[in-house]
């Protein structure tokens, strides 16, 4: 059986093509995100109180792409935008310069292949998430190993160091 570590997550670079307010939820955005596939993915994010709508447009983000799609207030969300998070503040993680939609995020010490879809019953995401943090340089890490786009660099929060990621 595969180890439960960050290699199980399908983390990819995406570009938000459009973002709008969710029609039925004041705290949610609905985004169309290019992740290097034939069609964009619809993503629902609870970022309204943290990121102005205009800052969501054409933004490069990191997406968790193998969560089981789930309806959020009636809209099917097909991925999750990764953010540094504390009770007071949320910052969208930024990919390295030169990243393009579809680029995979890898972890030097954890070389496995991601699951096609994370089995919600096995709570794999829930077991991995507590070990996701930004470090003292705001670099996104799993157990201290950076989120890396090979040949391009590491992913970062803007200002949030030693913070959780979700």
């Amino acid at each position: 059986s595969k180890p439960i570590d960050v290699s199980r997550l399908d983390l990819r670079i995406g570009c938000i093509i459009t973002a709008r307010k969710h029609p039925d939820a004041d705290s949610l955005y609905v985004e169309e995100v290019d992740v290097g596939e034939i069609a964009p993915r619809t993503v629902v994010s609870g970022l309204v109180n943290h990121v102005p709508l205009e800052q969501m447009q054409n933004r490069m983000v990191i997406l968790l792409c193998n969560l089981k799609p789930a309806k959020m207030r009636g809209v099917l969300s097909q991925a999750m935008v990764m953010c540094a998070s504390s009770p007071e503040k949320i910052e969208i993680l930024a990919p390295p310069n030169g990243s393009v939609p579809g680029d995979r995020i890898t972890f030097d010490a954890f070389p496995g292949e991601p699951d096609k879809e994370l089995n919600p019953k096995k709570k794999i995401w829930e077991q991995i998430q507590p070990d996701l943090h930004t470090n003292d340089e705001c670099v996104a890490t799993y157990k201290g190993v950076p989120f890396e786009v090979k040949g391009k660099g590491v992913c970062r929060a803007q200002t949030m160091s030693n913070s959780g990621i979700k």
């Epitope: 504390s86 009770p87 007071e88 943090h133 470090n135 003292d136 340089e137 705001c138 670099v139 890490t141 157990k143 201290g144 190993v145 950076p146 660099g153 590491v154 970062r156 030693n162 913070s163 959780g164």
Partner: antibody, heavy 118, light 112 residues
């Protein structure tokens, strides 16, 4: 493998200056904050200085005991970190360690001895 | 500055017995994130220190599961069950909540 190798230690008199260096290899140096920690003979560990990375404007932080006398700097092109020590005092006598830390991954050099005595 | 105070061990500790090292901080190290910003280090004789535990209770890579960290916002314990020869050295707690970073004075573990 990760290596941090300090150099430049030695014997100096009070009020004199010394610059110690740390050569890093085996990890992406430009992405890592770097620290100096010292240990006086027979004593405990004392944090001395920290320098952040380029995206964080190479911001520096110092212990009160060395503020205004010590300067930490780095050269990402050479994977080097430095500690310039001016107006040295006898109480600065210590083993100086170069270190970097990111949760599970914790790197320390072997240390370099600095002795300040008249 | 945050002051870190470590307790002494009744030295030496008999081989195979457990040892508990205590550390107190002058200010709570519990961050609003729910994490406690405390590290534990071991410095073996003649060696550089190395990290054992971060976030108060998370073992670093390669650290034996005989070591465990626990505590509250200001009172912390590092427990070593079934002490072995490789555990000998000086143990330091360190806070990384705010600058300046501060260490405890160290607790020496010797084995009988």
């Amino acid at each position: 493998a990760v290596h941090l190798v300090e150099s430049g230690g030695g014997f100096v008199q009070p009020t004199e200056s010394l610059k110690i260096s740390c050569a890093a290899s085996g990890f992406t140096f430009s992405d890592a904050a770097m620290y100096w920690v010292r240990q006086a003979p027979g004593k405990g560990l004392e944090w001395v200085a920290r320098i952040r990375t380029k995206p964080n404007n190479y911001a520096t932080y110092y212990a009160d005991s060395v503020k205004g006398r010590f300067t930490i700097s780095r050269d990402d092109s050479k994977s080097m970190v430095y500690l310039q020590m001016d107006n040295l005092k006898t109480e600065d006598t210590a083993m100086y360690y170069c270190t970097s830390w990111s949760y599970d991954f914790d790197y320390w050099g072997q240390g370099v001895m600095v002795t300040v005595s008249s | 500055d945050i002051v870190m105070t470590q307790g002494a061990l009744p030295n030496p500790v008999p081989s195979g017995e457990s040892a508990s090292i205590t550390c107190q901080s002058s200010k709570s190290l519990l961050h609003s994130s729910g994490k406690t910003y405390l590290n534990w280090y071991l410095q073996r004789p003649g060696q550089s220190p190395h990290l054992l535990i971060y976030w108060m209770s998370t073992r670093a890579s390669g650290v034996s599961d005989r070591l465990s960290g626990s505590g509250s916002g200001t009172d912390f314990t590092l427990k070593i069950s079934s002490v072995e020869a490789e555990d000998v050295g000086v143990y330091y707690c360190q806070q990384f909540l705010e600058y300046p970073l501060t260490f405890g004075s160290g607790t020496k573990l010797e084995i009988k």
